[in-house]
Interface confidence: low
């Protein structure tokens, strides 16, 4: 009778992570009597995957009933495949011996390759806000993919960026890989509504790349421009002075009126108008009772935006042309907060 051969018909098997791998193995004879074992790798460091005789192998199931006397199919299934399962698997026939079974013949081996999808790219920006014309860095990370070949692209509002550096780790052979990329983006005043997108393409994604996004609204700070103007006289002794705060982002803003350096009123921007580019405008006004002043008045609109150092704009109010009323010592009318803002 011809000597037993162990046949592994598949040279290689490709399985997606999470699926079940079927590793086929058949013997050509029932003789000699003895169990089958499956190993990953060859040589003394090989790893036992399944032992027909003993042991507990919860991820492994046999394709056929190995307890049947005439069974010659020793194929196995390994469930819930991960990239760590990649390698060459050998089906090995043992001959019954005393005290231990003796290795008799091995199959040629089946190489299991695992395709694992990359995780959703995570894009993160700088910890602190930056102003227009500054360059900021964004990072993109994706993990757990196999094989190593992967493509990463950066976009800002649909326009592909070129200033970035990408690394795939580890450099050598591994069960799975990670990608890390850093892109540099120059901010403009119009970037409040802008998005930075990291796009990852991989063979497992079947042409449908994964994207991670970051909103530049979380990164940018657009400082305001200030304009102080004197409005026509509302009454004989009153002058209306307005402070236009334009094109700022984010909304967090505090405004202080100063009369000759003395604080007159402080208010926080609440009811603002939004511009098309996502920045905000706001206006505050101050009623000045000119009869309370003998000399010219220096009015200052001081703005603290998003915790930054204050910026200010001043206006000199000429009072000499106005008749002075005796007994009045109030310089500014502190109207109710709901009246302070035009918008």
């Amino acid at each position: 009778e011809e000597e037993l051969q162990v046949i592994q018909p598949d040279k290689s098997v490709l399985v997606a992570a999470g699926e079940t791998a079927t590793l086929r193995c058949t013997a050509t004879s029932l003789i000699p009597v003895g169990p089958i074992q499956w190993f990953r790798g060859a040589g003394p460091g090989r790893e036992l995957i399944y032992n027909q005789k003993e042991g507990h192998f919860p991820r492994v199931t046999t394709v056929s009933d190995l307890t049947k006397r005439n069974n010659m199919d020793f194929s196995i299934r390994i469930g819930n495949i991960t990239p760590a399962d990649a390698g060459t698997y050998y089906c090995v026939k043992f001959r019954k011996g005393s005290p231990d079974d003796v290795e008799f013949k091995s199959g040629a081996g089946t190489e299991l390759s695992v395709r694992a999808k990359p995780s959703a790219p995570v894009v993160s920006g700088p910890a602190a806000r930056a102003t227009p014309q500054h360059t900021v860095s964004f990072t993109c990370e994706s993990h757990g993919f196999s094989p190593r070949d992967i493509t990463l692209k950066w976009f800002k509002n649909g326009n592909e960026l070129s200033d970035f550096q990408t690394n795939v780790d580890p450099v050598g052979e591994s069960v799975s890989y990670s990608i890390h990329s850093t892109a540099k983006v120059v901010l403009t005043r119009e970037d409040v509504h802008s998005q930075v997108i990291c796009e990852v393409a991989h063979v497992t994604l079947q042409g449908d790349p994964l994207r991670g996004t970051a909103n530049l609204s979380e990164t940018i700070r657009v400082p305001p421009t200030l304009e102080v103007t004197q409005q026509p006289v509302r009454a004989e002794n009153q002058v209306n002075v307005t402070c236009q705060v334009r094109k700022f982002y984010p909304q967090r803003l505090q405004l202080t009126w100063l009369e000759n350096g003395n604080v007159s009123r402080t208010e926080t921007a609440s009811t603002v108008t939004e511009n098309k580019d996502g920045t905000y405008n706001w206006m505050s006004w101050l009623l000045v009772n000119v009869s309370a002043h003998r000399d010219d008045v220096k009015l200052t609109c001081q703005v603290e935006h998003d915790g930054q150092p204050a910026v200010s704009k001043s206006h000199d109010l000429k009072v000499s042309a106005h008749p002075k009323e005796q007994g009045s010592n109030t310089a500014a009318e502190n109207t109710g907060s709901n009246e302070r803002n035009i918008y």
């Epitope: 042991g55 507990h56 192998f57 919860p58 492994v60 993990h143």
Partner: antibody, heavy 122, light 107 residues
């Protein structure tokens, strides 16, 4: 950084119940088997239970079988151990650990949480 | 159940000494053995897996050997931070079992 944070320990009377939680962060929790291992005061390590990535199968030490239930919520990155009919001999520090699965099961435990003390006393 | 027997239960040694701890399984477990280090009040830390593979980040003075029933953990040159209790663990059969531990103390 991989972190496992156990909670829910405390003093409980014999026969009562307690539920331990283990909050995982810094790794893809749903990709790993998880285990509970305990250590009685001044004693060695004793494996308690293990659960596979998708919640099945589960295995228990004979000393806790029928009383303890291991479970996981992958959406919350949390491992649980429901302990019923507690006995004095269940007094121990309970550690949760990542079970490094290979082909034949959850072979090695790494990393481990800092542990939570369960004291069963009347 | 597989019994894991560690010896000695404690060992006194000095910095720079070579320390060997043995672990015997009540039946053959191939290479399915791990070694852990535990310091007082801390969680165990994996040192060696698959009998001889060094866990990432573990100093190379730690090494493991053995197969079947007899296993050895060797610390080639004991350092001050190595004074701790060491446990072996079999990982092929349920229930998973640990050795009783070996305490490495300062001489």
């Amino acid at each position: 950084e991989v972190q496992l944070l156990e909670s829910g320990g405390g003093v409980v009377q014999p026969g009562r119940s307690l539920r331990l939680s283990c909050a995982a962060s810094g790794f893809t929790f749903a990709h790993y088997g998880m285990a509970w291992v305990r250590q009685a005061p001044g004693k060695g390590l004793e494996w308690v239970a293990v659960i596979w990535v998708d919640g099945s199968p589960k295995y228990y030490a004979d000393s806790v079988k029928g009383r303890f239930t291991i479970s996981r919520d992958n959406s919350k990155n949390t491992l649980y151990l429901q302990m019923n009919s507690l006995r004095a001999e269940d007094t121990a520090v309970y550690y949760c650990a990542v079970a490094r699965e290979t082909y034949s099961g959850p072979n090695w435990f790494d990393p481990w949480g800092q542990g939570t003390l369960v004291t069963v006393s009347s | 159940d597989i019994q894991m027997t560690q010896s000695p239960s404690s060992v006194s040694a000095s910095v720079g000494d070579r320390v060997t701890i043995t672990c015997r399984a009540s039946q053959g477990i191939s290479s399915w053995l791990a070694w852990y280090q535990q310091k007082p009040g801390k969680a165990p830390k994996l040192l060696i897996y698959a009998a001889s593979s060094l866990q990432s980040g573990v100093p190379s003075r730690f090494s493991g050997s053995g197969s079947g029933t007899d296993f050895t953990l060797t610390i080639s040159s004991l350092q001050p931070e190595d004074f701790a209790t060491y446990y072996c663990q079999q990982a092929i059969y349920f229930p998973i079992t640990f050795g009783g531990g070996t305490k490495v103390e300062i001489k």
